[in-house]
């Protein structure tokens, strides 16, 4: 039995006609099975295969090789969270967090907890003590005075 165009199988009861549109992106093999075009997958070949490495959790694509990030995620593979806007010396594990690096504090990690170490403000051999975020105190050697032992 010779089947009409696009019909396959015993009894010609299988249909496959190549298409490349909203409904699918496929060719047909000699048995009438859909063979997805490069970059497409799924039963109807209408699901794009995303960029290799694209986060399956935070990235997706509608075109092959693409990787579109969910809100709150960034990077080539959508695997990097976006920290809280204005976060200075902090990182995130989840979107919009601002987890401070060592010696930094405050909501935006912009408060120096180690002002002494960062700025070394005490002059003339004065001893520096961190007293709070962005705060310090200098103990001046004999003969010197002022906030930074500068006098």
């Amino acid at each position: 039995v010779t089947c009409d165009d696009y019909y396959y199988g015993f009894g010609c009861n299988k249909f496959c006609r190549p298409r490349d549109d909203f409904f699918g992106h496929y060719a047909c093999d000699q048995n009438g099975n859909k063979t997805c075009m490069e970059g497409w997958m799924g039963p109807e070949c209408n699901r794009a295969i995303c960029r290799q490495g694209c986060s399956p959790k935070h990235g997706s694509c509608k075109l092959p090789g693409d990787c579109r990030c969910q809100y709150g995620w960034q990077g080539l593979y959508c695997d990097k969270c976006i920290p809280h806007p204005g976060c200075v010396h902090g990182i995130c594990n989840e979107p919009w967090q601002c987890l401070c690096e060592t010696n930094w504090g405050g909501q935006l990690c912009d408060k120096d907890l180690n002002y002494c170490g960062t700025h070394q403000p005490c002059l003339n051999g004065g001893t520096c003590s961190n007293t709070g975020p962005d705060k310090y105190q200098c103990s001046c050697p004999e003969g010197y005075s002022g906030p930074n032992c500068e006098i």
Partner: antibody, heavy 116, light 107 residues
Framework: QVQLVQSGAELKKPGASVKVSCKVS????????IHWVRQAPGQGLEWMGI????????KYAQKFQGRVTMTVDTSTSTAYMELSSLRSEDTAVYYC?????????WGQGTLVTVSS | DIQMTQSPSSLSASVGDRVTITCRTS??????LTWYQQKPGKAPKLLIY???ILDSGVPSRFSGSGSGTDFTLTISSLQPEDFATYYC?????????FGGGTKLEIK
Amino acid sequence: QVQLVQSGAELKKPGASVKVSCKVSGYAFTDYAIHWVRQAPGQGLEWMGIINTYYGDSKYAQKFQGRVTMTVDTSTSTAYMELSSLRSEDTAVYYCARGYDGFAYWGQGTLVTVSS
Amino acid sequence: DIQMTQSPSSLSASVGDRVTITCRTSENIYSYLTWYQQKPGKAPKLLIYHAKILDSGVPSRFSGSGSGTDFTLTISSLQPEDFATYYCQHHYDIPWTFGGGTKLEIK
């Protein structure tokens, strides 16, 4: 087995909106598109649109453009069809159906009556 | 949009008769045509898809033919349960329009 179960009948006033749900079971929801078809009393079948359940992309018949919104919730395997600015001519049974090569599976239908 | 012209719109026939319903499209749809049967108060039932492939469980007295723009649904020997309304529908491109229907009644 494959099942499409629709929400119950609705009575709406002209100008209102209606949202019909279609919960599917028996197959992977995102493998098949969902279509919506309606049938006014004593009339024929009218195709309204299709939604790609994987991406959530939809395409509508020109007649319903701007008034219909089709959405999906993949977490509950449910498709939704919302029709706004209802008028008496929208009184019909609304069906969801599954398919690419014709509709082998249909919901039981939801009667939407628009009356003041 | 592709227009679907289904004829006749109604038809009276007797049990055992051979019945033919036709569907013509305004442009080439290859074999992207489906036939449905609908009984009052029920959802349509798929009979034939891709113009000539019988859906599983559909009796062999139903057959479909045609491609391009002209299609036919044939019931070789009418049975009492076949009295219903029949619709064609194309699924070539959006929108997937339906024919107007053919109401098959007992003579």
